[in-house]
């Protein structure tokens, strides 16, 4: 029976040109984590294998840094990076746990866009 739960950073925003840390945490299970995959839509960003360490996909090599921990750092953000990101925990014997993060990349500083979020 799968008893674990994934906590994520949830919905986050960052500035164009900046960087952001995507973080997930698996709790409430004693299952062994064998591998964590990070994905954006149908593109694999990175794999962190418990034995072998990190593999960064060739398409993201210059913009993705491993860590901290099992998290992932996205750098040089563009508006096209806006979207859903998934952390997939492969565990034994439980199976697979998936966490979702939504990232919004803003054109310029959050301060300048403050009005967008104000109630009229």
């Amino acid at each position: 029976m799968m008893t674990g739960t994934i906590e994520t950073t949830g919905n986050i925003s960052a500035e164009k040109g900046g960087s952001i840390i995507l973080q997930c945490h698996l709790s409430s299970t004693t299952a062994q984590v064998t591998q964590v995959n990070w994905e954006q839509q149908d593109q694999l960003l990175a794999i962190c294998n418990a034995d072998l360490g990190w593999h960064i996909s060739p398409s993201f090599k210059d913009r993705v840094a491993p860590g901290p921990g099992l998290g992932l750092t996205l750098q040089s953000l563009t508006v096209n990076d806006t979207g859903e990101y998934f952390c997939i925990y492969h565990t034994y014997p439980d199976g697979t746990y998936t966490g979702r993060i939504f990232l919004e990349v803003l054109e310029s500083s959050v301060a300048e866009h403050g009005a967008r979020f104000q109630i009229p």
Epitope: Q35, N37, D42, L44, I47, L52, H55, S59, H90, T96
Partner: antibody, heavy 119, light 107 residues
């Protein structure tokens, strides 16, 4: 260049253990990579059996978990496969291969060694 | 385990033709797929990783594409030396698994 070479007996009796050696030249097995065993059955089907990581951690295919052991001798730059309680179903060509985290695919392979299980 | 299915065991082609080999995963594997070529009497050789990236030294007539569950490996302008068995393999999750292979034969 990385080179891998399998060696071991070509004939094993049913219920006995199969033992193979992979000798690696041109790269230290403690530096990086996963050092894998893969077998190819008659009819061409390929099966990943398991690996030992550069740090010495083994990982096995669950279908073989109770019968397989992968170990290494770092002084000889070799890693080993032991498969116990073999049956005729274990007749195959056995390959050792390396997997690097740059590509996450088997980029160097040995030439393979044929093992027949028969009494 | 993830099952990788190559629906064609054999494909027949002529020198100079373009040929595409398909591979279907039983569940989502993102783009964590590699393709290998195995010539008669030889060990497999890595051609493509990350679904679409050619390995070092692989001629550009070999291409790969796909993500999710459906993958295609294409040889543009087949050469006589391309006669071989081609395998897909997923590395999305352990245990790593291979397709059953597609044998390319020259008409």
């Amino acid at each position: 260049d990385v080179q891998l070479q399998e060696s071991g007996p070509g004939l094993v009796k049913p219920s006995q253990s199969l033992s193979l050696t992979c000798t690696v030249t041109g790269y230290s097995i403690t530096s990086d990579y996963a050092w894998n065993w893969i077998r190819q059955f008659p009819g061409n089907r390929l099966e990943w059996m398991g690996y030992i990581s550069y740090s010495g951690a083994p990982r096995y295919n669950p279908s073989l978990k109770s019968r397989i052991s992968i170990t290494r001798d770092t002084s000889k730059n070799q890693f080993f496969l032991q498969l116990s309680f073999v049956t005729t179903e274990d007749t195959a060509t056995y390959y050792c291969a390396s997997l690097g985290t740059d590509y996450y695919a088997m980029d160097y392979w040995g030439q393979g060694t044929s093992v027949i299980v028969s009494s | 385990d993830i099952v990788m299915t190559q629906s064609h065991k054999f494909m027949f082609t002529s020198v100079g033709d373009r040929v595409s080999i398909t591979c279907k995963a039983s569940q989502h594997v993102s783009n964590a797929v590699a393709w290998y070529q195995q010539k008669p009497g030889q060990s497999p050789k890595l051609l493509i990783h990350s679904a679409s990236y050619r390995y070092t030294g692989v001629p550009d007539r070999f291409t790969g594409r796909g993500s999710g569950t459906d993958f295609t490996f294409t040889i543009n302008s087949v050469q006589a030396e391309d006669l071989a068995v081609y395998y897909c393999q997923q590395y999305y999750s352990l245990p790593w698994t291979f397709g059953g292979g597609t044998k390319l034969e020259i008409k």
